[in-house]
């Protein structure tokens, strides 16, 4: 999906209002310095591409993020403010359902959500130079 035509300011507002809080809740009890940010993004469409991938695509050691509260609200925000987004996600969801067995918070999942927090922070500051 090409995120170029999304309403970035509304997605940002939704993130600041509630999605960010859900990410913090998920990470509660984890030190902010525990994980290094290894995933980066260069502009807002790129950031949303990476956020979409990390949130909804199962990875080795963490197959369960798509059922978390922050993921449900992320899906809602992208569907509402990115034209045509929801129509592109059918195949992705079928794959996700096969991968999803139990909802267990592993260290790998915590690391992945830490990466997500970094991507969202970067999304919110699009004019900053890439580090």
């Amino acid at each position: 999906y090409d995120f170029t035509n999304c309403d970035f300011e509304k997605i940002k507002a939704a993130y600041l209002s509630t999605i960010s809080k859900d990410l913090i809740t998920y990470m509660s009890g984890t030190k902010s310095t525990e994980f290094n940010n290894t995933v980066s993004c260069s502009n807002r469409p790129h950031c949303l591409t990476e956020i979409q991938s990390l949130t909804f695509n199962p990875t080795a050691g963490c197959a369960s993020l798509a059922k978390e509260m922050f993921a449900m609200k992320t899906k809602a925000a992208l569907a509402i403010w990115c034209p045509g987004y929801s129509e592109t996600q059918i195949n992705a969801t079928q794959a996700m359902k096969k991968a999803r067995k139990s909802k267990v918070t592993t260290n790998k999942c915590l690391e992945q959500v830490s990466q997500l927090q970094g991507l969202w922070r970067r999304f919110n500051r699009p004019l900053l130079k890439q580090q």
């Epitope: 509304k10 507002a13 939704a14 600041l16 209002s17 509630t18 809080k21 859900d22 913090i24 809740t25 798509a66 059922k67 509260m69 449900m72 609200k73 899906k75 809602a76 925000a77 569907a79 509402i80 987004y85 929801s86 129509e87 996600q89 059918i90 992705a92 969801t93 996700m96 359902k97």
Partner: antibody
């Protein structure tokens, strides 16, 4: 304007199933989660589950032990809630409710259907 | 499962008086995930307050919400006849979504 219109009242026998519909209009049906909430006579509200019509993704309340199935038909902008193995305690008003971001970007159930009364009696 | 406990179950108030409704949450949640709904007999619930303290569209300023963590409050500064109803708090912090048992505000 956003509207959610539900199917009519039902009377069912214990052990049978009921399927309630919720037809949406006035917004992009595929892009908003639809929730189902029930209310037994004189009681509070109980969340049953939700569906994202765009891809069929669902989340259920485990308290219903697999008796609830929520589906959606994008061609008619209609969501369905089916409850099986009915018992007298399932007598309630069943509501569908859209969830979305309000003007302050808080996420909540912003539009509700009018409710469908389901009576379970032998 | 997060348990929402509302008190009192019934609040008898005279028109013009102040009403304070409480919602206690079994584990701490973000204020952005606590909402209030109003329901009148024979009607569907209506969104009333979003994110602890933000009034839904068209809700009069005599209503206010506050709180954080596990304790939240809905206050009606001066009750009008149309305010007599049941008010429910609800959390959107974790699944399953849960509601409080409701507080019925009735005419004294």
């Amino acid at each position: 304007q956003v509207q959610l219109v539900q199917s009519g009242a039902e009377v069912k026998k214990p052990g049978s199933s009921v399927k309630v519909s919720c037809k949406s209009s006035g917004y992009a049906f595929s892009s908003y989660w639809i929730n189902w909430v029930r209310q037994a006579p004189g009681q509070g509200l109980e969340w049953m589950g939700q569906i994202f019509p765009g891809d069929g993704d669902t989340t259920y309340n485990g308290n219903f032990k697999g008796r609830v199935t929520i589906t959606a038909d994008k061609s008619t902008s209609t969501a369905y809630m089916e409850l099986s193995s009915l018992r007298s305690e399932d007598t309630a008003v069943y509501y569908c409710a859209r969830s979305g971001f309000d003007y302050g970007y808080f996420y909540a159930m912003d539009y509700w259907g009018q409710g469908t009364t389901v009576t379970v009696s032998s | 499962e997060i348990v929402m406990t509302q008190s009192p179950a019934t609040l008898s108030v005279s028109p013009g008086e102040r009403a304070t409704l409480s919602c206690s949450v079994s584990s701490s949640i973000s204020s952005s995930n606590l909402h209030w709904y109003q329901q009148k007999p024979g009607q569907s619930p209506r969104p009333w307050i979003f994110g602890t303290s933000n009034l839904a569209s068209g809700i009069p300023a005599r209503f206010s919400g506050s709180g954080s963590g596990t304790e939240f409050t809905l206050t009606i500064s001066s009750l009008q006849s149309e305010d007599f109803a049941v008010y429910y708090c609800q959390q959107w912090s974790s699944y399953p979504l849960t509601f409080g048992g409701g507080t019925k505000v009735e005419i004294k």
